[in-house]
């Protein structure tokens, strides 16, 4: 048993039929010694008396809020949550496996630049009685500070018969140098509590590996005289690290017809302009990627040919 | 410890091309190592991230762009002395700071070159003959060092009398390639910045 926060404790249980459970000793937080009684939840049924209460925790019915009283007055509470371990593996019932980039990916994180700010998100099909808290650090043995905000519900989607809820959190490394070479990964830890079930999820990454620039901005077309060609120009996204001559991007320019089956013409360039042939009803899209470290491409910025 | 913004020179940057080749070569070599050593811990998640240049050079700090010198988190640099007669910029306007930066890059390359050559010698003794260092990568390191054109004492190749542990050597190779790729990215950024300055 360990303390998650004040008056909230997590009991780790091997979860299998007829498991013996865990013996837990609760102590009433009071200077009083005599006349103390214990109840579970809002029940008036007395479970025991004395400053300590010993219980065998086997299932969710044994979890909940234990309260010690004296003469009708509440002295203290202890909320017990369960963390299930089945076949040696901690349960992952609360969050959905996103399966990207690999199986058992529950947390996904992205950064728009090298400033040390990043966003993580996760999915669940649970919509009520759910709380998350997020902690992060650079490295684990001698952790350096990363500050995370509160997790918030960022999107709701319908997936077949199910509704899916996306939560996200923003974190910022306390003292980040954009030019630094990372040798210790960022660790992100999410505590998830659904009712009386506790689970924790972790992710470990280097900022350089989760970079995904915003799409190029100010995408414009300039027709070239007496030609079907156009000059496409764009700018670095505002959110990208500066100076741009140090944090350089490379770009992919695509000409795509109305039909998905039509052949796509693609050009790769380090410049912020390109000359392409603009077909009728086609659209021109540009996306960006770090020029030197191949992390994710940005989403496309698009403009119609006409 | 920052790069001044110099006026562009007509005889600009022979090093940019070489640094781009270097990044391409080390990335290809790392990919090859990951594929060939698929049953070894060779991915970024599996290896320990070690920097053989730590406390010997300070390339990141010495080559910091002017715009980042206001960022206090970037300025916890280590004092290191460098030989400062580089000739990568065709012009004679190479400032002390830029020379410090380029000589730091040169020292990095020299250290990695020695490590890679030592390692290759061990790998050539492996009866499995599973993996060797790409000669192209070693050549590209050499070319960039020549383009930087610093005079520096040659570091003797480390030789070892004991029988090499090939498993350890291959893991060390992965560690070295990951670290060198990260340094090659920094070098490329620096050269791009200098080229634009």
């Amino acid at each position: 048993i360990w303390e998650l926060k004040k008056d909230v404790y997590v009991v780790e249980l091997d979860w299998y039929p007829d498991a013996p459970g865990e013996m837990v000793v609760l102590t009433c937080d009071t200077p009083e010694e005599d006349g103390i009684t214990w109840t579970l939840d809002q029940s008036s049924e007395v479970l025991g008396s004395g400053k300590t209460l010993t219980i065998q925790v086997k299932e969710f019915g044994d979890a909940g809020q234990y309260t010690c009283h004296k003469g009708g007055e509440v002295l203290s509470h202890s909320l017990l949550l369960l963390h299930k371990k089945e076949d040696g593996i901690w349960s992952t019932d609360i969050l959905k496996d996103q399966k990207e980039p690999k199986n058992k990916t529950f947390l996904r994180c992205e950064a728009k630049n090298y400033s040390g700010r990043f966003t993580c998100w996760w999915l669940t099909t649970i919509s009520t009685d759910l709380t998350f808290s997020v902690k992060s650090s650079r490295g684990s043995s001698d952790p350096q500070g990363v500050t995370c905000g509160a997790a918030t519900l960022s999107a709701e989607r319908v997936r077949g018969d199910n509704k899916e809820y996306e939560y996200s959190v923003e974190c910022q490394e306390d003292s980040a140098c954009p030019a630094a070479e990372e040798s210790l990964p960022i660790e992100v830890m999410v505590d998830a509590v659904h009712k009386l079930k506790y689970e924790n999820y972790t992710s470990s990454f280097f900022i350089r590996d989760i970079i995904k620039p915003d799409p190029p901005k100010n995408l414009q077309l300039k027709p070239l005289k007496n030609s079907r060609q156009v000059e496409v120009s764009w700018e670095y996204p505002d959110t990208w690290s500066t100076p741009h001559s140090y944090f350089s991007l490379t770009f992919c320019v695509q000409v795509q017809g109305k039909s998905k089956r039509e052949k796509k013409d693609r050009v790769f360039t380090d410049k912020t302009s390109a000359t392409v042939i603009c077909r009728k009803n086609a659209s021109i899209s540009v996306r960006a990627q770090d020029r030197y470290y191949s992390s994710s491409w940005s989403e496309w910025a698009s403009v119609p040919c006409s | 410890r920052n790069l001044p913004v110099a006026t562009p020179d007509p005889g600009m940057f022979p090093c940019l091309h070489h640094s781009q080749n270097l990044l391409r070569a080390v990335s290809n070599m790392l990919q090859k190592a990951r594929q060939t050593l698929e049953f070894y811990p060779c991915t970024s998640e599996e290896i320990d991230h070690e920097d053989i240049t730590k406390d010997k050079t300070s390339t990141v700090e010495a080559c910091l762009p002017l715009e980042l010198t206001k960022n206090e988190s970037c300025l916890n640099s280590r004092e290191t002395s460098f030989i400062t007669n580089g000739s990568c910029l065709a012009s004679r306007k190479t400032s002390f700071m830029m020379a410090l930066c380029l000589s730091s890059i040169y020292e990095d390359l020299k250290m990695y070159q020695v490590e890679f050559k030592t390692m290759n010698a061990k790998l050539l003794m492996d009866p499995k003959r599973q993996i060797f260092l790409d000669q192209n990568m070693l050549a590209v390191i050499d070319e960039l060092m020549q383009a930087l054109n610093f005079n520096s004492e040659t570091v003797p190749q480390k030789s070892s009398l004991e029988e090499p542990d090939f498993y350890k050597t291959k893991i060390k190779l992965c560690i070295l390639l990951h670290a060198f790729r990260i340094r090659a990215v920094t070098i490329d950024r620096v050269m791009s910045y200098l080229n634009a300055s």
Partner: antibody, heavy 120, light 107 residues
């Protein structure tokens, strides 16, 4: 002793707004982990959950009725109020309030219910 | 929303019989299922929470089991006072939903 008691009009006209009050005793609406739900039951039919409010004001609504419902509480009066706009004859039902706590997460105490008929 | 399909709708049994009611959720609801008893003219009473936990003061002839999508409620030895409608309810997901109910009648 924990008790909940619903009160409100017996009859409402179509399109009118229904306001129901749940007055609780034996526990405080401001106690951490305390919550109250509203549930209704049309004559001879199954139960339907409408809305829930927690001690800290956080609330949940049944999405199919969300646009018509508002749940609120007045801790000093130990009351939880549910308003339902644009009433229709199909909303004729017995309306219950029930306590649901963040300890056993079950509706462990129910009021006796108040019957509301929607008719012109 | 999660549909709780409760079977059977009606049960006619003799005192002393064993009774089993099932509830099937349209998607997994973990163990977040409660069972209620509603006697004629009364409000519902909580019997079981977390699928298998008997609420305070509930006789031990009432038991619940199940996880995921399939849940069972059992009265081991029916007594005359058990005449009531029994409902299952999930609160894994909003909207919290109830089964259609099982009316238990005693011969």
């Amino acid at each position: 002793e924990v008790t909940l008691k619903e009160s409100g009009p017996v009859l409402v006209k179509p399109t009118e707004t229904l306001t129901l009050t749940c007055t609780v005793s034996g526990f405080s609406l401001s106690t951490s982990g305390m919550g109250v739900s509203w549930i209704r039951q049309p004559p001879g039919k199954a139960l339907e959950w409408l809305a829930h409010i927690w001690w800290d004001g956080d609330n949940y609504y049944n999405p199919s009725l969300k646009s018509r419902l508002t749940i609120s509480k007045d801790t000093s009066k130990s009351q939880v109020v549910l308003t339902m706009t644009n009433m229709d004859p199909v909303d004729t039902a017995t309306y219950y309030c029930a306590r649901r706590t963040r300890v056993n997460y079950a509706m462990d105490y129910w009021g006796q219910g108040t019957t509301v008929t929607v008719s012109s | 929303s999660v549909v709780m399909t409760q079977t059977p709708k009606f049960l006619l049994v003799s005192a002393g019989d064993r009774v089993t009611i099932t509830c099937k959720a349209s998607q997994s609801v973990s163990n977040d299922v409660a069972w209620f008893q509603q006697k004629p003219g009364q409000s519902p009473k909580l019997l079981i929470y977390y699928a298998s936990n008997r609420y305070t003061g509930v006789p031990d002839r009432f038991t619940g089991s199940g996880y995921g999508t399939d849940f069972t409620f059992t009265i081991s030895t029916v007594q005359a006072e058990d005449l009531a409608v029994y409902f299952c309810q999930q609160d894994y997901n909003s909207p919290w939903t109830f089964g259609g109910g099982t009316k238990l009648e005693i011969k």
